[in-house]
């Protein structure tokens, strides 16, 4: 027989299958051009001295063989004597070590057995009604296919699934979507309606994240507020990495989980932009304001659960950095300016009230005045800080107020609103005899004492009604009692107390008259 022909004679070896575990397997035969065909197979076991024979039986019952030698691939033409338009049965017999090993048979029509490719190029993955939808372009000239998929998770073996018949320029498959674990998918195709056609190779892995991205388990710490009024947010613990199936380890496009940091600046609600989203790797500097921080995990199917923290405001106060002058036209604040063209946000809220009741005002960008100060003024009619109570004031500054992470804290302090000098007047002044020439003066704490750092001191004034002599006694803001000594019996005195702030002299309390009775000896 000629080597190019299928030989219709008995093969040159005895006809007996050894039934050994090794041998030829996975025979695939295809048409590779208009008139040429190729069969290929795998051989399991030692290859030395092995001769392969491709056997073919026609529908008429006549059988022939091609001698392939040691090769595991053989090509022939439509002139080789093999019926290509009708079904034939093919198998491989391998003669080795005086025994014959036989592959499983394939029955097919060679002319219509086109070598099908697996899905090539970009496989688009999307979510559809709780399932996974994969879509790809049908390889050229291969419309009409059966498609299978296999999938595995990091802890499970391959499972096989069916995509059903496909008959279009694009093909698709609905597959199961896991809630909490990543999956690796591979797809393969074979010709539709072609009896016995071989499956293509498996496609490259398609790596699919779980439907729910893993909840980020991270911890933050916030550094102390620096001299520049900013504090760094640092990540104490990185998010855990998603466990991946074997074929997705290393480069696994599709399974990436991205973690984003969402900052919400709670303070200064009158600024233009309150939230900003950043990549988790880029840890920002924050002002001393209160923030809510959320870490949002997302994958190609969208965002998952987020983890939220509250970062409280830095309450460190600067008692002397803010000057407040109250005039007939209104009130003006002065503080050391940060730089040229700064926008300031002045926020105030009554002490002891919920943070949600904060009020604020945004200044236009301003340059320092000749004394290097920045200012903010308001009229009495505006009602700002108009009530006679303690307010907590924070001033923030930014050269780029639209950028949330560029705000810094200028100062935080307390201020007593309204007519502080009158409101702060101490009440319930009482005088008690202390000794033959001294008295103890007590009073109720000034309302100013509820405002940390505002009350500078009390001043107690004693007036001798006879000589009209006046003495004044400064008292620490934490004290509400003083002893006046060196007094004379039988003389009428009046005592008054006032409460002073750093920038305002208080109003004297109502005069309290007293005298030390003359002691008559027996």
């Amino acid at each position: 027989c000629r080597t190019s022909e299928c030989c219709f004679q008995d093969p040159p070896y005895p006809d007996a299958d050894s039934g050994s575990a090794s041998g030829p397997r996975d025979l695939r035969c295809y048409r590779i051009s208009s008139d040429r065909y190729e069969c290929s197979w795998q051989y399991e076991g030692p290859t030395a001295g092995v001769s392969h024979f491709l056997r073919c039986c026609l529908s008429s019952g006549r059988c022939c063989y091609f001698a392939a030698g040691s090769a595991t691939r053989l090509q022939f033409s439509d002139q080789a004597g093999v019926s290509v338009l009708y079904t034939v049965t093919l198998w491989v017999e391998s003669w080795a070590r005086n025994q014959t090993e036989k592959s499983p048979e394939v029955t097919l029509q060679l002319y219509n057995s086109v070598k099908y490719e697996p899905p090539l190029g970009d496989i688009k993955v999307s979510k559809l009604a709780g399932q996974l939808r994969m879509e790809w372009e049908t390889p050229d000239n291969q419309v009409g296919a059966e498609v299978q998929f296999r999938h595995r998770t990091p802890s499970s073996p391959w499972k096989l699934g069916d995509c059903g018949p496909q008959d279009d320029d694009t093909e698709s498959c609905l597959c199961p979507l896991e809630m909490n674990v990543a999956q690796e998918f591979q797809l393969r195709r074979r010709q539709l309606g072609s009896q016995g056609s071989s499956w293509s190779k498996w496609s490259s892995p398609v790596c699919v994240p779980p439907e729910n991205p893993p909840q980020p388990q991270v911890r933050f710490s916030v550094e102390q507020l620096g001299q520049d009024g900013r504090r760094r947010l640092t990540l104490k613990e990185q998010p855990t990495q998603l466990e991946l199936p074997e074929g997705c380890q290393g480069l696994a496009p599709g399974t990436e989980v991205t973690y984003r940091l969402q900052l919400h600046m709670l303070s200064c609600p009158c600024k233009a932009k309150a939230t900003r989203t950043l990549h988790l790797g880029k840890m920002p500097y924050l002002s001393g304001a209160a923030y809510n921080v959320a870490v949002i995990s997302s994958n190609q199917f969208g965002p998952g659960l987020n983890q939220t923290w509250h970062i409280p405001a830095d309450t460190h106060t600067e008692p002397v950095a803010l000057n407040i002058s109250v005039g007939t036209n209104g009130t003006t604040m002065y503080w050391p300016a940060r730089a040229q063209s700064m926008t300031y946000c002045i926020e105030w809220q009554p002490v002891g009230q919920d943070g949600g009741l904060a009020t604020c005002s945004l200044t236009a960008p301003q340059d320092p005045d000749p004394a290097g100060m920045a200012t903010y003024s308001w009229s009495r009619e505006s009602g700002a800080m108009g009530q006679e109570k303690c307010y907590y004031i924070t001033i923030f500054a930014s050269a780029h107020p639209e950028k949330l992470t560029l705000w810094s804290t200028v100062l935080s302090t307390y201020h007593f609103g309204g007519n502080a000098s009158a409101a702060g007047t101490p009440h319930h002044v009482s005088v008690k005899n202390h000794s033959l020439d001294s008295v103890s003066v007590d009073w109720a704490p000034s309302l100013l004492s509820t405002c940390p750092g505002v009350l500078k001191e009390y001043v107690v004034r004693c007036r001798d009604e006879d000589s009209k002599q006046v003495s004044e006694h400064p008292v620490q803001p934490t004290e509400t009692q003083v002893t006046l000594s060196g007094l004379r019996a039988g003389v009428a005195y009046t005592v008054q107390v006032r409460a002073d702030t750093a920038w305002l002299r208080g109003v004297w309390s109502q005069p309290q008259r007293f005298s030390i009775e003359v002691q008559v000896s027996d």
Epitope: D35, D78, Q79, V82, S83, V84, L85, Y86, Y111
Partner: nanobody
Amino acid sequence: QVQLVESGGGLAQAGGSLRLSCAASGRTFSNDDMAWFRQAPGKEREFVAHIDRNAASTNYADSVKGRFTISRDNAKNTVYLQMTRLKPEDTAVYYCAADPDHFGTTWYQQYTYWGPGTQVTVEP
């Protein structure tokens, strides 16, 4: 004497249609596999379509799949080739052939009986 005669060829515009017929005489062709081949100038004869004796199985060359349809009427001893969406590259002499051995091949030399052919010309 045994003979096959093709008809229906001619000039067609690209995108147009033609229907070729192959009438057999001299023997009963209803037991034979039938096929159409074509040969363009300077090229080898190439397989176009095949139909088995019962019209249960048909096969087409990739270049004509979806455009050409082979059929047969055994009572009339005739085989047809319906050609649609014609292209200039379909220009050739079309031959009808019979295979009484039912070998099922695309190799023209395996076919025993042949017609003289009919010219098909497709203009762009």
